[in-house]
């Protein structure tokens, strides 16, 4: 197993609708043909799987139908969009890229996404 | 909140061999930093050995290099010490320690743990 340097941004912003998008750009050493992208969650000295998706270069990401994560590739960068965030999910998003073929296997982690939700405020009613 | 118990300790003749289990209650230890300390009676506590987050990274003392193999199995909540060829110096009380690191660190071992195990006792004699 190799390691491989993983990028991504430090801090996002949820949109009030509770979608946060940011990219994670890896340093492919070689020519991988399968990639697998794993989004971890860091928080209360816990790390809990978010969502993963296994690609071929050049195909779309495919997450699972129930997953809250969707994303797309170009490169070596991953487009990663999670959605249906509350407040209660801030905290450190973390990509995982493996080069799972052909070998030699390669395993790079990012630094993390510090991602903060903030829950609108409901609308006050109005007389109008 | 995680807690770590050591099982596996016991009495075992210079030479042979034991398997020190740390697992995890209240949550998992993935992608902690896990160290095995040891202290003998007397002495200071030492760190044996310890594994990255990723467990792509272990350390060992110098007393036990060759001897002791550190590994974890996520699937199972569980960080190992396989101890051979014993000897009567490694007799002591072993702590597992665990730490979660900044994921910039997942690739090495912590400089100090947050949490320990309570110990379990090995004992090396004829």
């Known amino acids: 197993c190799k390691a491989m340097h993983v990028a991504q941004p430090a801090v996002v912003l949820a949109s009030s609708r509770g979608i946060a998008s940011f990219v994670c750009e890896y340093a492919s050493p070689g020519k991988a043909t399968e990639v697998r992208v794993t989004v971890l969650r860091q928080a209360d000295s816990q790390v809990t799987e978010v969502c993963a998706a296994t690609y071929m270069m050049g195909n779309e990401l495919t997450f699972l139908d129930d997953s809250i994560c969707t994303g797309t590739s170009s490169g070596n960068q991953v487009n990663l969009t999670i959605q249906g965030l509350r407040a209660m999910d801030t905290g450190l998003y973390i990509c995982k890229v493996e080069l799972m073929y052909p070998p030699p296997y390669y395993l790079g982690i990012g630094n993390g996404t510090q991602i903060y939700v903030i829950d609108p405020e409901p609308c006050p009613d109005s007389d109008f | 909140e995680v807690q770590l118990v050591e099982s596996g300790g016991g009495l075992v003749q210079p030479g042979g061999s034991l398997r020190l289990s740390c697992a995890a209650s209240?949550?998992?230890?993935?992608?902690?930093?896990i160290g095995w300390f040891r202290q003998a009676p007397g002495k200071e506590r030492e760190e044996v050995s310890c594994i990255s987050g990723t467990g792509l990274r272990t350390n060992y003392a110098d007393s036990v290099k060759g001897r002791f193999t550190i590994s974890r199995d996520n699937s199972k909540n569980t960080v190992y010490l396989q101890m051979n060829s014993l000897r009567a110096e490694d007799t002591a009380v072993y702590y597992c320690?665990?730490?979660?690191?900044?994921?910039?660190?997942?690739?090495?071992?912590?400089?100090?743990?947050?949490?320990w195990g309570q110990g379990t006792q090995v004992t090396v004699s004829s």
């Open positions: 320690t665990g730490k979660l690191l900044h994921p910039s660190l997942w690739s090495a071992c912590a400089n100090e743990y947050d949490l």
């Open positions: 209240g949550g998992t230890l993935d992608y902690w930093s």
